[in-house]
Each structure stands twice: as C-alpha cells, then as structure tokens.
C-alpha cells in the first residue's frame, strides 16, 4: 500500500498529538544533548510541514522518505559539530547511510545531569501552568537518557504521568498521592528501557533470525493454544515493529504496533483466552496489556515431542526441506509445553537440537546418531535450575542489600577492569533478581530469573561496548546471545588483572553522606566495596565483610555525632588504617 506522501500517511494514521510526541522522541533519541526548546522548534516545523502534505500530498518535498525529512531537519542544527563532534559527519552522507550513522552515535550512557525531582508544589504549578510543555518535557528527558526506549510504550508512560498529576495535584496530601506513583513510573520505566535495549541489541548485533527465535519461544509460551502458523504470523509482525523502533522509524513502529494490537484482538479466539480484558482498553493501554499478558493454559492433550522430532523417520527429510521452519516448529512445540523454562534456555535447547541434526543428518545412520538428542538437554536444564536454587538460598539468607554486595564482589573479581559505576549499577540490578523472582514458585522462577538476568547483562554489554576494557566481557557479550549468562557465570577471578593502588581519597567520606537517602547511602558503600576489591582482588569474603561492617559502624557513629565533619575526618583516618591492616594493603 504505497502512499504518495509517507509523512501525510503517518500524520493521518496517528493523529497530531501522537505524531508530535513521536517526532519529539525520535529527535531527542538522536540528538541527546540538544536543549528542549530547540527540539520543540524542530518538531513544530516538521508538524507544520506534515499538515501541508495532508492538505496536498503532491506538494513540494511531501514525497520524500521520513528518514530524508527528519535527517534534513536534524542537520539544520547550528551547533551540531561543537556539541556532537564527529556525529556532524553523518550529515555529509546520503540516506540510508545517514540514518545508520545517526543510529551508531546513539549513546547509552550520555553525559547528562541526573534528573532531580523538584518539590511537589513546584511540579504541580508547572503542570497547571502549561500542561502540554510539562508533558513534552517528560518525553524529552526520558527519550534523551534512554535512546532505545520503546516509543509507543513511552506514550503510555506519558499518559500515566499525566494521570498521576491530574489526580494528585488536586489531592489533600499531594506528596503522599504523587510520589509513590512517580517512583513506580521511574522503576517501571527503567525496566522497560532495559528490556527494549535487549530487543534492539538482539536485532542489531545478532540479526533478525535471533530476534525471531526469541519471539517464537516467548509467544509460544504465552499463547500455547495458538497454532504454529498463527504464532509465526505474530512473530513476523512483532519483528517488523521492533525492527522499526530500534531503527529510529518511530512513526511506522507506533502505527504497526497499533495494527498488531488490533489484529490480536480481532483474532483472540485463535490466540489466547487471556486477552479479553486487554482488548477492552484504549489503544495505548491495550498494547501494553497484551505485551504483559499472562501465559494461557496449556492444551491438555499435547502429545510427546519425541514422536515428531526424534522417533520419526522423516526428521532429516523435514529438516532438509525447510530448516528454519522445522526448527521453528521444534521451538514452538517445546516452548508451549514449558512455560517453566526461560526463553534463553529454550533457545539453547533448540540450538543443541539444530547442531545435532546438522551433524547426524550427514551421518551413515542418522536416526541412530540423533536418537539420544533429548538426553543432551538434561545438563542444560539443570544448570540454571541449580544456579537459581543456590542464589535464591543466598538471597533469603542475606537480604537484598547484602546479596547485592556478594554479587558486587563476585563480578568485580571476574571483570575488575570495568568502571566502578558500571559494576555498581549492574551488580545492584543483578541483585534485584532475588526480590523479583525468588518469591515465585519453582515453575515461575527460571523464566523470571534467567530472562531478567539476560536484560541486566545486556546493560553491561552495551555500556562496555562504548569503551571496551575487558576481553572477557567482549567475549561473553559477542559470542552467543543466549549463552551470555552462562559465560559470565563461568568466569573465575581474573588472574591477569593488575590491582589498583590504594588511594585514601577514595575512602574519605564527609558529613553529606548523612543526608543521603538509604538507596544513595548504599550506593556510596557499594562503590567503596568495589574499590576495595579492585585494590585487593584476592581478599577473602571474611576480610571484606569485616571492613564493610567497620565502615557501616563508622558512618552510623559519625552521623550521630555533634560535630559530624570532624568525626568523619578523624575516625575516617583510623578506619582507613585499620582497613589497610586488615587487608594487608
């Protein structure tokens, strides 16, 4: 369905409000350092142009591609070279190379100030004074800090953000109403960003086939009653949506996502019995709800997998005729029977099955060769099961903070070259797997834990890719998407690491720590712990625990002192000396 004017087509499909919001997100995700006002100006210019094309699709430039229109607009920014350096060279290229160039310059860790939340009354005044600008600013600030945030989902977050202010700014206790809602949106937003980042990494680093395999496994678990052909159609459509969003084609992505939600709801009888409530909601809520919907019940009468995939004489014939279709069917059949497995485990099993068929279908007696293929699955299944059991026991014993500390030590010893802020951020997130997943029954633990760990380890991979500092991280991140977690789990202490010098400044603390939130105080202590391990990678758990206990006592003591600053100065020196002695520094 070719349109004379792509920009007019998308404007009409999406409506002015969503069109403007999505163009703002797109621009902020590309030019992450540009001021808000500059972006608003660019968006308004694009919107006015789109309206002329709606009025007359034959008007000048209306036939240009969205990449051409948007790229030309971005390249009008006067300070491009000063602000972005070599990214300005993108503007010398032609499409599609120019867009690829912009994509390559997206920064997962932009040098932007932390978002500080103003007082509730200040926020409510700003909201009432100019609601439109207030909400645009939210989109802009999130998009520039999360350049791969799933744009249609960000519209859903903005809708909830608006609803929170609309409700709470009229409440008797504004803060009690608003702050928990904003905390929830912040935490959900970070999780949503990280999940989408993995989808984009999967597509960009490992290709469409890898993403499709992931989607087959996940959708088959979620919709086990759907036929393989139905799942395949959904996978194809979902792949298109995410390819578009990850490629910066946000208008097409949002439009296609809406079409996919419409299709799913029109065909829910052949997809899942769990979609009814989702499909009664408005568009943004509907799409979000479908993406999060619980797994449908498994059909009761599913036959054994062995018949079609091991015992049949036609295995090699079926495999040879259409390899990816046959492997897709295997993955579909295995996944719909195993909602208790993680997606990455299902993909490892499919890869093992594929490798076995590649080898055996060329053998003298193929059936004899692949007859025991399912036996090879047992250790692959047991490895994550055992790991999750051990780590959930440790989490239950230690609690979240100390469990995070155990992971901080573990990962700093594995990859000590990684920057301290990255190690703290990643290990804290790894540690959250305990409270997120260990409360679940056995049947839900593995999909919760291992698929969450895949998302967190991808954060490490994308941050490390910007500035590679460790071959071990590069290897685990690039060799196999589905084996990243086992690869990191298998790493031992890095014996090639040259320990960092002891620097007393790193362990000097001031009274300002006393006014920090509990979370920020934890981060300070965890930063010190990482630095300790970098100085003394061979330190035992007991040594590190003793130093950290002394440190916690020191902070507590000085925060209660009348002259806090003097306490931190004098007691701090003693603590540093005692720690050096305890660790043999």
């Amino acid at each position: 369905d070719a349109h004379k004017s792509e920009v007019a087509h998308r404007f009409k499909d999406l409506g002015e409000e969503n069109f403007k919001a999505l163009v703002l997100i797109a621009f902020a995700q590309y030019l992450q350092q540009c001021p808000f006002e500059d972006h608003v100006k660019l968006v308004n210019e694009v919107t006015e142009f789109a309206k002329t094309c709606v009025a007359d699709e034959s008007a000048e430039n209306c036939d240009k591609s969205l990449h051409t229109l948007f790229g030309d607009k971005l390249c009008t920014v006067a300070t491009l070279r000063e602000t972005y350096g070599e990214m300005a060279d993108c503007c010398a290229k032609q499409e599609p190379e120019r867009n690829e160039c912009f994509l390559q310059h997206k920064d997962d860790n932009p040098n932007l100030p932390r978002l500080v939340r103003p007082e509730v009354d200040v926020m409510c005044t700003a909201f009432h004074d100019n609601e439109e600008t207030f909400l645009k600013k939210y989109l802009y600030e999130i998009a520039r800090r999360h350049p791969y945030f799933y744009a249609p989902e960000l519209l859903f977050f903005a809708k909830r953000y608006k609803a929170a202010f609309t409700e709470c700014c009229q409440a008797a206790d504004k803060a009690a109403c608003l702050l928990p809602k904003l905390d929830e949106l912040r935490d959900e937003g970070k999780a949503s960003s990280a999940k989408q980042r993995l989808k984009c990494a999967s597509l960009q680093k490992f290709g469409e086939r890898a993403f499709k395999a992931w989607a087959v496994a996940r959708l088959s678990q979620r919709f086990p009653k759907a036929e393989f052909a139905e799942v395949s159609k959904l996978v194809t459509d979902l792949t298109k949506v995410h390819t578009e969003c990850c490629h910066g084609d946000l208008l097409e992505c949002a439009d296609d996502r809406a079409d996919l939600a419409k299709y799913i709801c029109e065909n829910q009888d052949s997809i899942s019995s769990k979609l009814k409530e989702c499909c009664e909601k408005p568009l943004l809520e509907k799409s979000h709800c479908i993406a999060e919907v619980e797994n449908d019940e498994m059909p009761a009468d599913l036959p054994s997998l062995a018949a079609d995939f091991v015992e049949s004489k036609d295995v090699c014939k079926n495999y040879a005729e259409a390899k990816d279709v046959f492997l897709g069917m295997f993955l579909y059949e295995y996944a719909r029977r195993h909602p208790d497995y993680s997606v990455v485990l299902l993909l490892r099993l499919a890869k093992t099955y594929e490798t076995t068929l590649e080898k055996c279908c060329a053998a003298a007696d193929p059936h004899e060769c692949y007859a025991k293929v399912f036996d090879e699955f047992k250790p692959l299944v047991e490895e994550p099961q055992n790991l999750i059991k051990q780590n959930c026991e440790l989490f239950e014993q230690l609690g979240e903070y100390k469990f995070q500390n155990a992971l901080l030590v573990r990962y700093t010893k594995k990859v000590p070259q990684v920057s301290t802020p990255t190690l703290v951020e990643v290990s804290r997130n790894l540690g959250k797997v305990g409270s997120k997943c260990c409360k679940h029954p056995e049947a839900k633990r593995m999909p919760c834990a291992e698929d969450y760990l895949s998302v967190v380890l991808n954060q490490l991979c994308v941050l490390h890719e910007k500035t590679p500092v460790s071959d071990r991280v590069t290897k685990c991140c690039t060799e196999s998407l589905v084996n990243r977690r086992p690869c990191f789990s298998a790493l031992e202490v890095d014996e090639t690491y040259v320990p960092k010098e002891f620097n007393a400044e790193t362990f000097t603390f001031h009274a300002d720590i006393c006014t920090l939130s509990e979370k920020e105080r934890q981060i300070k202590k965890q930063t010190a712990l990482v630095e300790l391990v970098k100085h003394k990678p061979k330190a035992t758990k007991e040594q590190l625990k003793a130093v950290m206990d002394d440190f916690a006592a020191f902070v507590e003591k000085c925060c209660k002192a009348d002259d806090k600053e003097t306490c931190f100065a004098e007691e701090g020196k003693k603590l540093v000396a005692a720690s050096q002695a305890a660790l043999g520094l």
């Epitope: 070259q417 990684v418 920057s419 590679p468 500092v469 460790s470 071959d471 590069t474 040259v498 960092k500």
Partner: nanobody
Framework: QVQLVESGGGLVQPGGSLRLSCAAS????????MSWVRQAPAKGPERVSA????????IYADSVKGRFTISRDNAKNTLYLQMNSLKPEDTAVYYC??????????PGQGTQVTVSS
C-alpha cells in the same frame, strides 16, 4: 568521545630502542589500568604489557620481559612503552587500550614498529 593516539613507532635495527607514547582523552585516565597491545600481520592481538591506574603495578608478556618497560604520567594523561633490545619478531602495529582489552578503545590507528636490518 574516548580518544587514544599512539606515536613513536618507526623503523629500527635489531638491538635498537624506541619509546612509544599514547595520549589519552575523553575519559578519566587516572581511574583505569592501561595496556599496550600489538598485532603482527596475519596474527591475533597480543597483550604486551599492562599497568595499574596509579602506575605501581605492572605485568609483561614473557616474550618482552626484561626488554620493555611500561609507565604512565597521569598528570599528562599519557601512557608510555620503552622498548629496548628490539628483535625482528617485535615487528607489529602497537596500540594502547583501556583495562585489559585487546580491542582498540578509540579511533586511534596504532603506531607501526618495524625491526629490520
């Protein structure tokens, strides 16, 4: 933007000396251990030497022990490699990297060292 610019390479006779420099910018140089890595034609990268963030800890590949010395000047954001008693097998492109990576950390092209009579 991380930038690592290597210099000081050249053509030298066996037994001769060279001093390589690596000027760093775009990151907190003094916070990171650094490495010198070399890649000879048709061979994989080899980590020659590494130094801790403050400069007191060093390690060397067996093939260069006693001949090469790594050092750094954190005030100047510069890493050095003093190469003495050079051998033909030291011929390679030498580049500096952050941490223990053998992947070039920035757009630097490395510096060519050729040992030949």
């Amino acid at each position: 933007q991380v930038q690592l610019v290597e210099s000081g390479g050249g053509l030298v006779q066996p037994g001769g000396s060279l001093r390589l420099s690596c000027a760093a910018s775009g990151f907190t140089f003094g916070q990171f251990g650094m490495s010198w890595v070399r890649q000879a034609p048709a061979k994989g990268p080899e980590r020659v030497s590494a130094i801790s963030s403050g400069g007191s800890g060093t390690i060397y590949a067996d093939s260069v022990k006693g001949r090469f010395t790594i050092s750094r000047d954190n005030a100047k954001n510069t890493l050095y490699l003093q190469m003495n008693s050079l051998k033909p097998e030291d011929t390679a492109v030498y580049y500096c990297t952050i941490g223990s990576s053998t992947t070039p950390s920035g757009p630097g092209q490395g510096t060519q060292v050729t040992v030949s009579s």
